[in-house]
Amino acid sequence: FKVATPYSLYVCPEGQNVTLTCRLLGPVDKGHDVTFYKTWYRSSRGEVQTCSERRPIRQLTFQDLHLHHGGHQAAQTSHDLAQRHGLESASDHHGNFSITMRNLTLLDSGLYCCLVVEIRHHHSEHRVHGAMELQVQTGKDAPSNCVVYPSSSQDSEQIT
């Protein structure tokens, strides 16, 4: 399987909410001994590999933000902890999973990574990640709503 990032760049005004999205693609093993672990974290475009370093998102670690479930189940993170920090990560039945960040500030700008681990008990873990950039802007040059740039091209879309 692979992880797709529909948008590689999100440009948002300060105070706006944004939902960063990843999508699981390809064949997904639905055996009873296969489970999935999904999470989000901040990172940097490291020399060795993008997304290798795991930094907190608004003080919440990737452990705090993880989703755990079998292949077909939907899941959400611990509501209380995440929502206290204006965050919510969620996953649906169709391979989409996302993190929503509320009331963006300039400090939220940076590289965000989604991580999917396919756990094949008795065999191995298979991990795949996706990366996307969030730019939070302020002042007269900031957009009125979030503008997202698809990963495949630089055509932008506005999210209201």
Epitope: D33, T35, Y37, V48, Q49, S52, F62, Q63, H66, H68, G70, L115, V117, I119, H121, H122, H123, S124, E125, R127
Partner: antibody
Framework: QVQLQESGPGLVKPSETLSLTCTVS????????WSWIRKPPGKGLEWIGY???????NYNPSLKSRVTISVDTSKSQFSLKLSSVTAADTAVYYC???????????WGQGTMVTVSS | EIVLTQSPATLSLSPGERATLSCRAS??????LAWYQQKPGQAPRLLIY???NRATGIPARFSGSGSGTDFTLTISSLEPEDFAVYYC?????????FGGGTKVEIK
């Protein structure tokens, strides 16, 4: 902050079953792998196996025929049973939290188990 | 199973000196390697994950490097509390395996 605490008898007779319990406090047991590792005197660390929160287990092939790991989520505990023990099973036994695609990040303080008649 | 070989078995150094510990895998583990520190009577403590990332709260004097089969843990300037046994551990597949350990002792 999540903490782990091992408990169980410190002395087990040869051919009997070693039974240890790990109690998880300060966090949920309903995620991650929950592992057992041991360190025999003068030797290195050996991974025994884990139970995933969902109930799936995975054991070291070298011990698989003798090991059972179980979980009781209502008590926030997971347990190790090692049957037909010999002196070679004398070790400090640790329980630990293992996060997928990460590491064994939180460990109990360990409990010494001696196999002797 | 993947065998991890650590060298040297013992490293005798003085505080302030640089420590370089090696871990070699019998087959590639990509960068899925962790380092732990263990002091007498204590549980192991996670230092490095994914070969080169410091775990939370680990001082900057600890650094990891390498990928594939050869890995290094470096302690840039030894503090008195750094004298301990260090283990590497792979997680590219199960069973999880550890190296035999390197003891860093005071010279």
């Amino acid at each position: 902050q999540v903490q782990l605490q091992e408990s169980g008898p410190g002395l087990v007779k040869p051919s009997e079953t070693l039974s240890l319990t790990c109690t998880v406090s300060g966090g949920s047991i309903s995620s991650y792998y929950w592992s057992w590792i041991r360190k025999p005197p003068g030797k290195g660390l050996e991974w025994i196996g884990y139970i995933y929160y969902s109930g799936s287990t995975n054991y070291n092939p070298s011990l698989k025929s003798r090991v059972t790991i179980s979980v009781d989520t209502s008590k926030s505990q997971f347990s190790l049973k090692l049957s037909s023990v010999t002196a070679a099973d004398t070790a400090v036994y640790y329980c630990a939290r293992d996060i997928p695609a990460f590491a064994l990040d939180i460990w109990g303080q360990g409990t010494m188990v001696t196999v002797s008649s | 199973e993947i065998v991890l070989t650590q060298s040297p078995a013992t490293l005798s150094l003085s505080p302030g000196e640089r420590a370089t510990l090696s871990c070699r895998a019998s087959q590639s583990v990509s960068y899925y390697l962790a380092w732990y520190q263990q002091k007498p009577g204590q549980a192991p403590r996670l230092l490095i994950y994914d070969a080169f990332n410091r775990a939370t709260g680990i001082p900057a004097r600890f650094s990891g490097s390498g990928s594939g089969t050869d890995f290094t843990l470096t302690i840039s300037s030894l503090e008195p509390e750094d004298f301990a046994v260090y283990y590497c551990q792979q997680r590219i597949n199960w069973p999880l395996t550890f190296g035999g350990g390197t003891k860093v002792e005071i010279k």
